[in-house]
Structures are given as structure tokens and as C-alpha cells.
């Protein structure tokens, strides 16, 4: 079934048809479009059976149309559906305005419906003239355009119309008067020299095609000097002028045949430059340095004359480029006074001569060779020398005994110190120093130096040997060691080694608590920053333990008896006797005796009583083994 035909306007020159129909039923549809008043022949369209809508363009504006449609199914035509609709009114332009006005251009703005026009046709016509109008077209999407290339201070009529394929709107018009040609701004002279000046001027950017500059000597009928420069410039150097001369300079701008009113300025060029401030300083002992002042870019060259004050005949002449303001004059005699003269040349003209006197320095010297910071393998050298003269210094190091190869160093003439290393310790050296300049070798100066000895660890000595220990002592260089390690090992290696760490200032260690009568090995090492010296070694045997022996009882009496004993000579400080009755019926008796004694009479005991006697010696606070005996007092 074909039904629901609707027709809507699509703009002012088209209609849109929509209808409904069963899916996949129709081979095609036939559409007929006819003006309602049947003025023009009907338009027929055949569209595929899959469509349910179609746009019909290219119709007349504001016109009623009758639209019919029928479908074809296997050659069968459905009943016709019809509808009526009108196209829209043709669009009009809105308003046109001149947004910006210059002296040679303007900006045109207008309003118009979106998408209505393919392009706009704009006509620019000078008012009150028969000159041909300027025509231009702009795309239909634009609403603004610049109109360049106009005349200054001129009335224009501008019309615009919108155009489609078969239609053009009613034109809109606007009238406008272009601005006057802009005037130049200020003309100033910013720099004046004796032969040139610099002009600066102001003007709106992008206005002028070019500028014409006229330079005329004031009060002179001579032909003026004309220059034409691009319109982008705002500054110009005018060279080739005469010194101390008044000039009139005029400037006008030109734009598309128009010329501005000229600007003028008067200026006087500077007087011819003079040389000034000639200064002469010594450059070492064989040269002088000249400095002078002069105007920049003024001189073609300078002529310098150098002669010894006392020798008028022998003068040196030099010609130098005009860009220089200083020069070194080498190859002179040391400690000699010189007169130096200079003049400049400007386009053949000579400036007045400037003169000065100066003396060269004394011949360079070296001295005060000094040796410092001596170590076992190195030392530092320092010396004095005339500054800025020497290219190199030569240092020779020779050992006094001539056993080693001579070492030679060549170092920069700027140096005043050197570090000499890689030398053997405890060695005498002679150091020779000489300076070399391009045309001189100084006399040689010398100094002596002796490298320090390596830090020593020596003379391990064992003293105060006794049964229980001994004293270890050694010699070492001052401040050479952080610490010492003393290791004591019994010769039979039966006991654990004993290790003693001592500060680097100590030089002895008293060892006690050793075993009597055995051999020991003692090793002493020094340490510097954790590095160990090879040890000094010594072997020692402790003395045998001193003995008390042969305790004898004699001469018994009712109240006592005599005791005697033997002991090592010179070992014991004293002896201790302990006496007690064997039945322990009385308090024990303890007697301390001085070392030399070997006998003692004991009295005050009970008669006919058995006593137990013990004896031991004391040496340096230690007890010897005890010896015992039994004794009985006589009957009363």
C-alpha cells in the first residue's frame, strides 16, 4: 500500500517528499511535479523502489506546486497519491556597512542568510565620475572583504548583490569618503661625524613605497645629492660629507604617485678628527706597547716612528691599518729610553703628530730558588722570576753523589712552583733552574735538598729479664706510626700468641705473667693507615724460677731451735717463715726476714713439742715454692 505522502519546502527553490510503502514491494516510483497553475510543463522523476523520500530542487521561489506519486509492482501501477505545497520566498541581503576607512582602502561588512548565495558581486565606483567601476566577486560564505587600491580623499559608491545560479538579489549600496594621504612624522639627525650623519624619521608602517632624501650643502648652488630608499626604512646613514660643513637635508615619502609634504633638517658635520691619548708602556725588557685613541672608522692608516732618545739616526718606521688602536714594538734594547711618534692619514690628509717617551725594562731575572715540603720521595720548589717574559723554565735534578741519572723538567714560563717526586729517600740533591725567553737564557741558579729518610722501626731491645717477664723497647721515627703491635709467642708454639696494641707514641712494653724458664719470640710491627711494617724480631728465655732449698733444723733447745736454708742470690726481696705445732694447739708464728738472711734462731716455743716449719721467698711480690721441715724442742 502506498500512502502518507507529505511535501515540505526545502529552501526557496526546492521541495522534499516523504511517503510510506511496504518494504521490498516496489520496483520503482514515478513522481510528477507541476506548477499549480500549470504554466509550465510537468517534471517527471523515476526513483528506485527502495526510496521513501526524495528532494526536488530547481523550482521557482514562492510558487505553489502539485506533486503526484505512484508505485510500480511487476508492471502494475498503484493508485496515485497527490499533495500540494509552495516553495519559500527568495532571500534578501541584510545591511551593508563600511567598517574601516583608510586613505587607500576600506573594509566592507554585510549580512545575508547562511547558504543562500553562491557568490556576492561588489561594484566600487568613484562618485561623480565616468571612470569605469571596479568589479569583484567574493564567495557566498563571506560576510566581509577588504577593498584596496583606492584613491585618497575620494567619494566612492559601493554596491553589493547576492547571486545564485538563476537569481540575483536587489543591490544594496553605501557611500564613503577615503582618508587624506598621511603626513610624514619627525625627521631627526641622531649621529653626526666629520664625514657622515645618520637620519631617523617616523611614519605610519607600510604606508610609503619609497622615500626620497636630498642632501644639499647650505648656501651652495652645487647640485644636491639625492637618494631613494625603500618605504620600509626609518633610518639612513649619509656618508661622504665634508668636515665642518653645514647641510640641509630634506625627506619626502611617495606612495602610488602621491608625494608627501617634505620634512627638512639642518646639521653641521664635525671637525676633522684628531689623534689623542698616546700612551707607551713597557712590554718586557725588549719591547714597548703603544695605545692611542682615535675616531672609529676614520683613518686609512697610522704611521709610527720609534727611535732611541740618544740615537737620532736610527729610527724604525711602521705603517699600521687604521682599525688598530694599539701595537707592540718588539726587538728593542733592554733598559733603553725611546721616543715614539704617531700620526694618522684620512683620505690623504695627515693628522698632527703625537709623541711620547718610554724606557724598556731591565733584562729578565730569576732568583730565590727555595725547597720546601720535603718527604722521603719528593719536595716542592718555588722561585721568583720577572713576569710575562719566560716561555719555559728548565729544572735539572742531580744527586750529589752522581749515582742516579739526571732528571730534567721543562715547565711553563707562567709557573713559579714545581713538585718533584719519585726520588729515593735519604738522598742529597742539587737543583738547577734556568729560564728561557725567545732571545735569552738566564744564568742558572741552584739549591740543595735532601729527601727525608723512610720512617724507621729499629733497635728492638729486651731488658729486665726475670722469671716472669721482661721489658721490650724499640726505636721509631717520630709521628711515623699510628700504632704498634707487639706479639709474644712461646718458642714451642704451645700457647696462644699474646698481642698488645700500643699507641704510635709508645716505645716500650713491660711484659709480666710469663712462664719461667722458657723461650719466647717477640715481634714488633708499626702501622700507618692500616699498613703494617715488616716486624722486628727478638728471642728471649725467661729466667728459671728462683728457689729456696735445704731447710735444716739444728741446735734444738727447750724453747726453740736454729733454722738455716739456701736460696738464689740477689733474687729474693725477703723470706717468710711459718711455724706451728703439729697438734695445732697454739697460734701459728709468722716471721718475715730480709733477703740476705740464710739463718734464724727461733725462741719462745714450748718444750718437747713437735713443730711444722714452712719457708718461702718473695721476689717482686711473687712467692717461690715452699720448703718444709719438722723440728722438736728439747726436754726442759
Amino acid at each position: 500500500e502506498l500512502e502518507n505522502l507529505t511535501v515540505t519546502e526545502v529552501g526557496w527553490d526546492g521541495l522534499r517528499l516523504n511517503w510510506t510503502a511496504a518494504d521490498q514491494a516496489y520496483e520503482h516510483f514515478i513522481i510528477q511535479v507541476q506548477e499549480a497553475n500549470k504554466v509550465e510543463a510537468a517534471r517527471n522523476l523515476t526513483v528506485p523502489g527502495s526510496l521513501r523520500a526524495v528532494d526536488i530542487p530547481g523550482l521557482k521561489a514562492a510558487t505553489p506546486y502539485t506533486v503526484s506519486i505512484y508505485g510500480v509492482i511487476q508492471g502494475y501501477r498503484t493508485p496515485v497519491l497527490s499533495a500540494e505545497a509552495s516553495t519559500g520566498e527568495t532571500p534578501n541581503l541584510g545591511e551593508v556597512v563600511v567598517a574601516e576607512v583608510g586613505w587607500d582602502a576600506l573594509k566592507l561588512n554585510w549580512t545575508a542568510p547562511e547558504g543562500a548565495y553562491e557568490y556576492f558581486f561588489i561594484q566600487v565606483q568613484e562618485a561623480d565620475t565616468v571612470e569605469a567601476a571596479q568589479n569583484l566577486t567574493v564567495p557566498g560564505g563571506l560576510r566581509s572583504t577588504d577593498l584596496p587600491g583606492l584613491k585618497a580623499a575620494t567619494h566612492y559608491t559601493i554596491t553589493i548583490r547576492g547571486v545564485t545560479q538563476d537569481f540575483s538579489t536587489t543591490p544594496l549600496s553605501v557611500e564613503v569618503l577615503t582618508e587624506e594621504v598621511p603626513d610624514m612624522g619627525n625627521l631627526t639627525v641622531t649621529e653626526v661625524s666629520w664625514d657622515a650623519l645618520r637620519l631617523n624619521w617616523t611614519t605610519p608602517d607600510g604606508t610609503y613605497d619609497q622615500f626620497t632624501i636630498q642632501v644639499q650643502e647650505a648656501d651652495q648652488v652645487e647640485e644636491a645629492h639625492n637618494l631613494t630608499v625603500p618605504g620600509s626604512l626609518r633610518s639612513m646613514e649619509i656618508p661622504g660629507l665634508r668636515a665642518g660643513t653645514p647641510y640641509t637635508v630634506t625627506l619626502h615619502g611617495e606612495v602610488r604617485g602621491h608625494s608627501t609634504r617634505p620634512l627638512a633638517v639642518e646639521v653641521v658635520t664635525e671637525d676633522l678628527p684628531q689623534l689623542g691619548d698616546l700612551a707607551v708602556s713597557e712590554v718586557g725588557w725588549d719591547g714597548l706597547r703603544l695605545n692611542w685613541t682615535a675616531a672609529d672608522n676614520a683613518y686609512e692608516h697610522f704611521v709610527i716612528q720609534v727611535q732611541e732618545v740618544n740615537k737620532v739616526e736610527a729610527a724604525q718606521n711602521l705603517t699600521l691599518p687604521g682599525s688598530l688602536r694599539a701595537v707592540d714594538i718588539p726587538g728593542l734594547e733592554a733598559a733603553t729610553p725611546y721616543r715614539v711618534s704617531i700620526y694618522g692619514v684620512i683620505r690623504g690628509y695627515r693628522t698632527p703628530v703625537l709623541s711620547a717617551e718610554a724606557s724598556t725594562a731591565k733584562e729578565p731575572e730569576i732568583g730565590n730558588l727555595n725547597v720546601s715540603d720535603i718527604t722521603p720521595e719528593s719536595f716542592n720548589l718555588s722561585w721568583m722570576a720577572t713576569d710575562g717574559i719566560f716561555e719555559t723554565f728548565t729544572i735539572e735534578i742531580i744527586d750529589s753523589n752522581r749515582l742516579l741519572e739526571t732528571v730534567e723538567y721543562n715547565i711553563s714560563g707562567a709557573e713559579r712552583t714545581a713538585h718533584i717526586s719519585g726520588l729515593p729517600p735519604s738522598t742529597d740533591f742539587i737543583v738547577y733552574l734556568s729560564g728561557l725567553a725567545p732571545s735569552i737564557r738566564t744564568k742558572t741558579i741552584s739549591a740543595t735538598a735532601t729527601t727525608e729518610a723512610l720512617p724507621l722501626l729499629e733497635n728492638l731491645t729486651i731488658s729486665d729479664i726475670n722469671p716472669y717477664g721482661f721489658t721490650v723497647s724499640w726505636m721509631a721515627s717520630e709521628n711515623a706510626f699510628d700504632s704498634f703491635l707487639v706479639t709474644v709467642v712461646d718458642s714451642g708454639k704451645l700457647l696462644d700468641p699474646q698481642e698488645f696494641t700500643l699507641s704510635g707514641t709508645q716505645r716500650k712494653l713491660e711484659l709480666r705473667g710469663l712462664i719461667t724458664g722458657i723461650g719466647y719470640e717477640v715481634m714488633v710491627s708499626g702501622f700507618t693507615q692500616g699498613h703494617q711494617t715488616k716486624p722486628l724480631r727478638a728471642e728471649i728465655v725467661t729466667e728459671a724460677e728462683p728457689e729456696v732449698d735445704n731447710l735444716l733444723v739444728s741446735d734444738a733447745t727447750p724453747d726453740g731451735f736454729r733454722l738455716s736454708w739456701t736460696a738464689d742470690e740477689g733474687v729474693f726481696d725477703n723470706f717468710v717463715l711459718k711455724i706451728r705445732d703439729t697438734k695445732k694447739q697454739s697460734e701459728p708464728l709468722e716471721i718475715t726476714l730480709l733477703a740476705p738472711e740464710r739463718t734464724r734462731d727461733i725462741t719462745g716455743l714450748r718444750e718437747a713439742t713437735e713443730y711444722e716449719i714452712e719457708l718461702y721467698g718473695i721476689s717482686k711480690g711473687r712467692r717461690s715454692q715452699t720448703v718444709s721441715a719438722i723440728a722438736t724442742t728439747a726436754m726442759g
Epitope: T375, L454, P455, A480, G530, H531, Q532, T533
Partner: antibody
Framework: EVQLVESGGGLVQPGGSLRLSCAAS????????MGWVRQAPGKGLEWVSA????????YYADSVKGRFTISRDNSKNTLYLQMNSLRAEDTAVYYC???????????WGQGTLVTVSR | SSELTQDPAVSVALGQTVRITCQGD??????ASWYQQKPGQAPVLVIY???NRPSGIPDRFSGSSSGNTASLTITGAQAEDEADYYC???????????FGGGTKLTVL
């Protein structure tokens, strides 16, 4: 486990200064002497400086004397090297190292690179 | 002098014995210490004192000293022993630590 971690290296212009730090752990810092050793690119080891346990004694190689200062903060277990007036020839990897009283440097950090260049 | 002199390079066949030497006046008084350094790593102490090895150092490394020369001996060199070896000593209070120039050991 003994650990020494250096920091503070970097790029510096000749004449400039840097301060290196070495954070220590895993041993009794206050009982160890400490030191700095450097190694220029492609070159051998060069001892630079050392300091005793409590920081009262310091030692320097001739090449850095008067320019470098070694110090330590036992409360922070940290060793320092203040480097002033740096020269191009001071460019190197700087290692922090420890040594107990009776042996040389027995533990080293992984190093920090100091580059002295314009 | 306190400069310790080492051969720049030494090579050894795998499993063979190699001796690296170090010469200097300071070695008359002090024992040398020896460090192994592999590329991109910090040095490792391998021998110090008369012939002491820190824990973890294989017993194929040993040290000896005679006169002004110290020696590091590797008995049965392994591929992992390929490294730079630096000797190190003291020269007393002014030059407390001195390193040799290093020896590059190649294990073939």
C-alpha cells in the same frame, strides 16, 4: 653486612665546589678509620684523604691539600669530603672506604662520579 | 721512591700459576696490600700484611715480600680472577697511602 653508600657527586664547573657524603652501616663506625680513594676514568687508584676514629687527625694527598677537607659525624655514621677549587683533573669516581686498626681498606662503597667541566 | 711500580699487564693460562709484582722503596719497611678490581666494580682487598687473606678470598691467593719487592701469587688461576690488581702500601706519615699503577691480569 657492611655497607658504604656515597652520594653528592655530579657535574661542576672548574673552580666550583662539591660535598661528598658516605653513609656507613653494618659495623662500628666510630671504631674505624675512614678514607677516600678516587679513580679517574680509565686510570688507576689514587688515595685522596683519610681520618682517624674520632676525627682529630686528618691526612691528605699533595694533589688535594688545601682544597679538600675530610670530616666525619660519628653520631650520624657519616663521612664527608668537602671539595673546593675543583679542577678538570679532579674528575673521577670517588670511593669511600673503611679500615680497622690493623689492616688497610677492607670495605669500599660503589663510588660516586664527580665530573669537573665547563 | 714511594711510587709503587707494577707491570701494566700479565697473562696466565687457565689453571696455571701467576705472580704479580710490585716494587718500591717503601716495601723495604712495609708489607704490601693487594686489591682486585673488576670492570665497573669497587676494589676488593685480597691480601694484606705478611700473607693474610680476608674471609671469602680463596686460598689460591697468597702474598710474599722480599727487599723492596712484594708479590701476589695466584696458584691455579681461574677465569674469574681476570681483573686489575693494585698493590698498596704506606710511605710513612706524609704519604700514608700509596697505590701502584695496577696490573691487568688476563686468564687465557
Amino acid at each position: 653486612e657492611v655497607q658504604l653508600v656515597e652520594s653528592g657527586g655530579g657535574l661542576v664547573q672548574p673552580g666550583g665546589s662539591l660535598r661528598l657524603s658516605c653513609a656507613a652501616s653494618g659495623f662500628t663506625f666510630s671504631g674505624s678509620r675512614m678514607g677516600w680513594v678516587r679513580q679517574a676514568p680509565g686510570k688507576g687508584l689514587e688515595w685522596v684523604s683519610a681520618i682517624n676514629e674520632e676525627g682529630g687527625q686528618t691526612y691528605y694527598a699533595d694533589s688535594v691539600k688545601g682544597r679538600f677537607t675530610i670530616s666525619r659525624d660519628n653520631s650520624k655514621n657519616t663521612l664527608y669530603l668537602q671539595m673546593n677549587s675543583l679542577r678538570a683533573e679532579d674528575t673521577a669516581v670517588y670511593y669511600c672506604a673503611k679500615h680497622p686498626p690493623h689492616r688497610p681498606f677492607d670495605y669500599w662503597g660503589q663510588g660516586t662520579l664527580v665530573t669537573v667541566s665547563r | 721512591s714511594s711510587e709503587l711500580t707494577q707491570d701494566p699487564a700479565v697473562s696466565v693460562a687457565l689453571g696455571q700459576t701467576v705472580r704479580i709484582t710490585c716494587q718500591g722503596d717503601s716495601l723495604r719497611l712495609y708489607y704490601a696490600s693487594w686489591y682486585q678490581q673488576k670492570p665497573g666494580q669497587a676494589p676488593v682487598l685480597v691480601i694484606y700484611g705478611k700473607n693474610n687473606r680476608p674471609s671469602g678470598i680463596p686460598d689460591r691467593f697468597s702474598g710474599s715480600s722480599s727487599g723492596n719487592t712484594a708479590s701476589l701469587t695466584i696458584t691455579g688461576a681461574q677465569a674469574e680472577d681476570e681483573a686489575d690488581y693494585y698493590c698498596n702500601s704506606s710511605h710513612g706519615p706524609r704519604r700514608p697511602v700509596v697505590f701502584g699503577g695496577g696490573t691487568k691480569l688476563t686468564v687465557l
